[in-house]
Interface confidence: low
């Protein structure tokens, strides 16, 4: 069988949800000594990066300027050491946001509930769409989907204190083109034991863990560095 290198890891820097016309940055983490990295979009070659010096860097960044719906979709990457190519990375879904309208998110019976109560989020959007998405801040990979015309509902069932936090919703014009995010709605859940509303943690939205972590080898030590870790605005 043909020998291949281990598959690289593909990540989005800052977030996989990129506002239209902004720059997206994808990181492909392969191995030291890789002389070439290729970014593939929907199965076709999209961009090539050659790290310098290859023996000191274990990955590259691909900058995708002027994000739009034509650039949103499934990305993967591969790398080459000498003549040997790696396996293909897992697929990364890159989404363009801030398309068209802004939805309105509401929660019933209200934003302050007791543990065990049934809660439903409602996401309303004027523009024609069939799919709505609900995201909890800090957990943007855990996307809940619901279907409706102008409004969709997200029944949460009986909530616990684990549900507390800030939520936003999007309308989706296709799997990779989303609306502007709604204003956040903070869900406050009073616990069974404690009798006060627990303020939600409010991390920045989207997730902070999505940042690209690439390793640069400096001399004998490997220095874990955040490369250009600030979000592209």
């Amino acid at each position: 069988p043909k020998q291949t290198l281990p598959k690289p890891i593909i990540r989005a820097e800052s977030t996989y949800m990129v506002p239209k016309e902004k720059q997206a940055t994808l990181c492909c983490q392969g191995s030291y000594g890789a002389v070439e990295y290729q970014l593939h979009f929907e199965g076709s070659l999209f961009a090539v990066e050659r790290p310098k010096p290859p023996e000191r860097i274990n990955g590259v960044k691909f900058h995708i300027p002027d994000m739009n719906s034509r650039k949103a979709g499934r990305y993967s990457c591969i790398y080459r050491v000498g003549e040997l190519w790696s396996e293909r990375s897992d697929l990364l879904d890159l989404v363009v946001t801030e398309m068209y309208d802004t939805p309105t998110l509401s929660v019933h019976p209200g934003p302050e509930v007791t543990s065990g109560e049934k809660v439903t989020f409602y996401c309303r959007l004027d523009t024609a769409t069939s799919m709505f998405l609900l995201l909890k801040e800090g957990r943007s990979r855990d996307v809940q989907r619901s279907y409706g015309k102008v409004q969709a509902e997200f029944p949460m069932g009986p909530v616990t204190t684990a549900h507390r936090g800030s939520y936003r919703c999007f309308g989706s014009y296709n799997n990779y083109a989303w609306s502007f995010p709604s204003e956040p709605v903070k869900l406050l859940v009073t616990g069974d034991i404690e009798n006060t509303s627990l303020a939600p943690t409010d991390p920045t939205f989207p997730d902070s863990w999505d940042t690209c972590l690439l390793t640069r080898e400096t001399g004998l030590q490997k220095d874990l560095a955040l490369w250009d870790h600030t979000a592209q605005n």
């Epitope: 309105t104 309303r124 024609a128 102008v150 014009y173 502007f180």
Partner: antibody, heavy 116, light 107 residues
């Protein structure tokens, strides 16, 4: 009841700008997008663009992009449409319309006349 | 962009008769089609939303049908106040577009 009240008629010179206002009442302003539609004398309806007062997100008809600027002031529940580099063919009645999927409520219209 | 075409441009009908107005979209818009009535010197008024959904305060003689690309507005028995211009509108995708209008006049 829902009401959209627009500013009064304007007479402008070619090359100048006009800013039309639309004050909303009777509903939560930030929950609906506000759109602008114009109608030239004896002609049909033409969509200019829309704005989400929630966070200011806009969408424009490509024909007006760069010339039309839509803004909204949540504190006064007022939407604005500014059109620059006016020419005679911009003479029309300009309407604001609340969009709840369809344009369910309309302002009374503002006549803009462009003449030298 | 989605082009909306209305027919006929002018329709002459007698009061009490039935009027049928047509609207065609250049591509499928599902049922995201809205109808408006406009009288001289007035703003348009919403009659039907989502192809067939009635609007509170609009007389029951107004009804809509269709899906995809072909839509119809029917006025079952014309009243004198129904003579006006009628517009259909694509509510499916931007840019939002209107038909050129059908003028309903008294025969």
């Amino acid at each position: 009841q829902v009401q959209l009240v627009q500013s009064g008629a304007e007479v402008k010179k070619p090359g100048s700008s006009v800013k039309v206002s639309c004050k909303a009442s009777g509903y939560t302003f930030s929950e609906y997008t506000m759109h602008w539609v114009r109608q030239a004398p004896g002609q049909g309806l033409e969509w200019i663009g829309g704005i989400s007062p929630n966070i200011g997100g806009t969408s424009y008809n490509q024909k007006f992009k760069g010339r039309a600027t839509l803004t909204a002031d949540k504190s006064t529940s007022t939407a604005y449409m500014e059109l620059s580099s006016l020419r005679s063919e911009d003479t029309a009645v300009y309407y604001c319309a609340r969009r709840g999927g369809s344009f369910d409520y309309w302002g009374q219209g503002t006549t803009v006349t462009v003449s030298s | 962009e989605i082009v909306m075409t209305q027919s006929p441009a002018t329709l002459s009908v007698s009061p009490g008769e039935r009027a049928t107005l047509s609207c065609r979209a250049s591509q499928s818009i599902s049922d995201y089609l809205h109808w408006y009535q406009q009288k001289p010197g007035q703003a348009p008024r919403l009659l039907i939303k989502y192809a067939s959904q009635s609007i509170s305060g609009i007389p029951a003689r107004f009804s809509g049908s269709g899906s995809g690309t072909d839509f119809t507005l029917t006025i079952s028995s014309l009243e004198p106040e129904d003579f006006a211009v009628y517009y259909c509108q694509n509510g499916h995708s931007f840019p939002l577009t209107f038909g050129q209008g059908t003028k309903l006049e008294i025969k």
